[in-house]
């Protein structure tokens, strides 16, 4: 039995330059206890996009909409999208550890592609 599922329902999202991109992520449980972070890319070189607990992410807002009892919404919106934002975004659950939190489970990823700004 899975302890928790990380659900990124959209494999890909296409957004026009200058618009906002909504990246969806839902989880089935808060347990194990620990933070949720968003990254672009995978592996050692991945880029932190959003961490609720610390850091400054002026282009990112949270967009929780799900009110179902067994779906916790950890979706984000990134404003003013540029071609440099293209890539695959991962919603990642961490488990509280000592001294450092441990990566527990990642969503399957959502590929963001950026269309040219309509003229």
């Amino acid at each position: 039995e899975d302890e928790l599922q990380v659900i990124q329902p959209e494999k890909s999202v296409s957004v026009a330059a200058g618009e906002s991109a909504t990246l969806r992520c839902a989880m089935t449980s808060l347990i194990p206890v620990g933070p949720i972070m968003w990254f672009r890319g995978a592996g050692a070189g991945r880029e932190l996009i959003y961490n609720q607990k610390e850091g400054h992410f002026p282009r990112v807002t949270t967009v929780s909409e799900l009110t179902k009892r067994n779906n916790l919404d950890f979706s984000i919106s990134i404003s003013n999208i540029t071609p440099a934002d293209a890539g695959t975004y991962y919603c990642v659950k961490f488990r509280k550890g000592s001294p450092d939190d441990v990566e527990f489970k990642s969503g399957a990823g959502t590929e963001l592609s950026v269309r040219a700004k309509p003229s």
Epitope: E1, L30, I31
Partner: antibody, heavy 118, light 112 residues
Framework: EVQLVESGGGLVKPGGSLRLSCAAS????????MSWVRQTPGKGLEWVAT????????YYPDSVKGRFTLSRDNAKNSLYLQMNSLRAEDTAVYYC???????????WGQGTTVTVSS | DIVITQSPASLAVSLGERATISCRAS??????????MHWYQQKPGQPPKLLIY???NLESGVPDRFSGSGSRTDFTLTINPLQAEDVATYYC??????????FGGGTKVEIK
Amino acid sequence: EVQLVESGGGLVKPGGSLRLSCAASGFTFSSYVMSWVRQTPGKGLEWVATISSGGTYTYYPDSVKGRFTLSRDNAKNSLYLQMNSLRAEDTAVYYCASSVDGSAFDYWGQGTTVTVSS
Amino acid sequence: DIVITQSPASLAVSLGERATISCRASESVDSYGMSFMHWYQQKPGQPPKLLIYRASNLESGVPDRFSGSGSRTDFTLTINPLQAEDVATYYCHQSSENLPWTFGGGTKVEIK
């Protein structure tokens, strides 16, 4: 119909042990986070322990950490709380509670009373 | 620990009127726009019953005269209109990432 039935409470001397059980029915037990919450007239409601749906992760407040151990048997739809080194301040009604998402407690049992006294 | 201050400790309201209960947390219980504050009703001799989850979501089967609002540190449970069967003690509970999870001290609601 969801049912949570606690058992195992009773009178025990300080320093003694008790094992509480909670039998669950009416829902998919193995998908739910399970907890114990206790209630005393003086202190109100106090969270005691939580275990993840698969049983891998357990959490306790400092007041019981190292003395209480929470476990579950998903094949038997059962939850267990082993309470050791009991103190007078552990006297309370102990409720078993389920949570589909690990946040709010959806359903509660009727409770079992634990009295720690010499 | 996150301390929850619940007020008032007791409340007497006329039938058909509005009852309002407040809970204030010592720090934010929000994450990703969700508020991990919940409300329960407990009648004498019974276990608590979930009314509202995540600040404002009505639990299935709960009458819509119960409503919840608030975010971050300040939360409110409203019963409007109050009915005789609502006489009970009400508790708030936070389940944020910051353990331990904690409860408010309770509010006893009576009929005036």
